[in-house]
Amino acid sequence: MRRGPRSLRGRDAPAPTPCVPAECFDLLVRHCVACGLLRTPRPKPAGASSPAPRTALQPQE
């Protein structure tokens, strides 16, 4: 079972704590959950009309 936060202070005051690798703290459910990696795509070539939208690497299934 994964580590949750060391203390739960109720829904109005979540307390993020370190999670194991490949996990991050979800403020919504107040526990460590599986997480993918955010990434910023390489910029578009010069002259492109708008910056590339930010995307993410999918979590491991």
Partner: antibody
């Protein structure tokens, strides 16, 4: 392929009970939180409940607290919504959804990325 | 609970138009906002999460911005398949509340 399939909806009288199931495939539910969201006919989306199967924690919308119970069986990779004391205002399409998270400075940045097809619950006499 | 207020509730637009939908939170939600698209009889689809991150497979004509209490979903050039209802949702704290929806119709 990630998939969520709901079942268990139907017609029930006020005060009655139903149990909805959400069978997941293509991922393990213990790694994510699973949510139930409902949509009354012609209305918007309303969150109902969530469960974190790997930890066993749950939470509910005030409108269903004390009447609905969310649970999960990790061995069956399935989440459930037990609905008791049903009211006419519970009539809706019920969706289960997976919350996906991406690591943003150690905190989840995410949303509900996979949804089931929905199951209709009608509460009427 | 945090209220999410969308505007407008509906709009009419033509193919190729730039469309902007706004969502206001009743309190600061940082960037914990997602946007969904829903077509009649179908489940919602995730478009944007964390206010400005485009979900995998979503066309780049969709973009999101904002933080704190004010958020925007923009469709840079409306396509026929974009006529649908759009919802914002905050996920900073339980309950994760949705906006009331914005229906984008054909002019």
């Amino acid at each position: 392929e990630v998939q969520l399939v709901e079942s268990g909806g139907g017609l029930v009288q006020p005060g009655g009970s139903l149990r909805l199931s959400c069978a997941a495939s293509g991922f393990t539910i213990s790694s994510n939180s699973i949510h139930w969201v409902r949509q009354a006919p012609g209305k918007g989306l309303e969150w109902v409940a969530w469960v974190t199967p790997g930890v066993g924690s749950t939470d509910y919308a005030d409108s269903v607290k004390g009447r609905f119970t969310i649970s999960a069986d990790t061995s069956k990779n399935t989440a459930y919504l037990q609905m008791n004391s049903l009211r006419a205002e519970d009539t809706a399409v019920y969706y289960c959804a997976r919350r996906v998270c991406y690591n943003r400075l150690g905190v989840c940045a995410g949303g509900m990325d996979y949804w089931g097809q929905g199951t209709l619950v009608t509460v009427s006499s | 609970d945090i209220q999410m207020t969308q505007s407008p509730s509906s709009l009419s637009a033509s193919v190729g138009d730039r469309v902007t939908i706004t969502c206001r939170a009743s309190q600061d939600v940082s960037t914990a906002v997602a946007w969904y698209q829903q077509k009649p009889g179908k489940a919602p689809k995730l478009l944007i999460y964390s206010a400005s991150f485009l979900y995998s497979g979503v066309p780049s004509r969709f973009s999101g911005s904002g933080s704190g209490t004010d958020f925007t979903l923009t469709i840079s050039s409306l396509q026929p398949e974009d006529f649908a209802t759009y919802y914002c949702q905050q996920s900073l704290m339980t309950p994760p509340t949705f906006g009331q929806g914005t229906k984008v119709e054909i002019k």
